[in-house]
């Protein structure tokens, strides 16, 4: 029951996370114009990964896509790639995890197969979340670097520029959405990996040999025992079938007809 809940919750959390990653990737507010000491009083600019927008003081907003890579920072391409990889991995992870859900029966799929699929989807969610967090963090770092460079330019007039003519950009809403979404996807992935342990077959049957002394002679008895992984309840090596062998706590020294040849 706990395994099903953990797996289900992991799936839902990852689903919300991936939806957030998609939303963040599509959002236009990755960076917004810093309004403090703003040199452009008539318009307010904000940018996304795919297009740039301008909002006039009248409230009219206009957006335009980046039709060329010219004039765009190389890091923008890296961020786009990270976000897309995150979305793709997350989407595949969701698809795999749907079939892995314990509450969904698909033919005669064994628990071991479900466990493997749960682990696979969990790892995919973890990598997806990390990609999103990395992408957003790279972009944020780029903004911080540019912000302080612009601040330096504003007060020192670097490169022959006039001191007052600088625009600074700060974190947009998409960055926060991306961080939270990446974190949720990561948490969901960890939950799926934890659920995988509970789904895995806990016990393995194998043939064991028991030796015990009975008087002056030694008897050899083949017997079947149940080995425990430590997760199950079979901690006392109870018999699965009676092949004539006894567990250590059942061994007695009285003779039987098999003891003497």
């Amino acid at each position: 029951m706990a395994v099903t809940a953990c797996q289900g919750l992991g799936f839902v959390v990852s689903l919300i996370g991936i939806a957030g990653i998609i939303a963040a990737t599509c959002m236009d507010q990755w960076s917004t114009q810093d309004l403090y000491n703003n040199p452009v009083t008539a318009v307010f600019n904000y940018q996304g990964l795919w297009r740039s927008c301008v909002r006039e003081s009248s409230g009219f907003t206009e957006c335009r896509g980046y039709f060329t890579l010219l004039g765009l920072p190389a890091m923008l391409q890296a961020v786009r790639a990270l976000m897309i990889v995150g979305i793709v991995l997350g989407a595949i992870g969701l698809l795999v995890s749907i079939f892995a859900l314990k509450c969904i029966r698909i033919g005669s799929m064994e628990d071991s197969a479900k466990a493997n699929m749960t682990l696979t989807s969990g790892i995919m969610f973890i990598v997806s979340g990390l990609c999103a967090i990395a992408g957003v963090s790279v972009f944020a770092n780029m903004l911080v670097t540019n912000f302080w460079m612009s601040t330096a330019n504003m007060y020192t007039g670097m490169g022959g520029m006039v001191q007052t003519v600088q625009t600074r950009y700060t974190f947009g809403a998409a960055l926060f959405v991306g961080w939270v979404a990446g974190g949720l996807t990561l948490i969901g992935g960890v939950m799926m990996c934890i659920a995988c342990r509970g789904l895995a077959p806990e016990e393995t049957n194998y043939k064991a040999v028991s030796y015990h002394a009975s008087g002056h002679s030694v008897a050899y008895k083949p017997g079947g025992f149940k080995a425990s992984t430590g997760f199950g309840s079979n901690t006392k090596n109870k018999k699965i079938y009676d092949g004539g062998a006894r567990t250590e706590d059942e061994v007695q020294s009285y003779p039987s007809k098999h003891d003497y040849v």
């Epitope: 452009v40 600019n45 206009e62 335009r64 004039g71 920072p73």
Partner: nanobody, 111 residues
């Protein structure tokens, strides 16, 4: 980065005309002109977006016209009926991924 090259500034008599141009290395999303007179705050003159929407400062409406070529690689500012108070350094502004600024061109209107 986007490179901006301004031209067209100079000395002109009051009532005269000048045409400023600003050439960008890429087709920009929004362009415009700002000016700063000695000892004064910088102010908006005019802006134009890639869709052709224009925005003017009240002080230049009816006298100045901003325009851009089809690809928005060049932004022009046609200044007519110039007044001595129009004397300033005119800065070209371009917005693409970031805001870019030219080094400025001096416009002096003598009375």
């Amino acid at each position: 980065d986007v490179q901006l090259v301004e031209s067209g500034g100079g000395l002109v008599q009051a009532g005269g005309s000048l045409r400023l141009s600003c050439a960008a290395s890429v087709g920009i999303f929004m362009g415009g002109w700002y000016r700063q007179a000695p000892g004064k705050q910088r102010e908006l003159v005019a802006t134009i977006s890639s869709s052709g929407r224009t925005n003017y400062a009240d002080s230049v409406k009816g006298r100045f016209t901003i325009s851009g070529d089809n690809s928005m690689n060049t932004v022009y500012l046609q200044m007519n009926s110039l007044k001595p108070e129009d004397t300033a350094v005119y800065y070209c502004y371009a917005h693409y991924w970031r805001d870019y600024w030219g080094r400025g061109t001096q416009v002096t209107v003598s009375s």
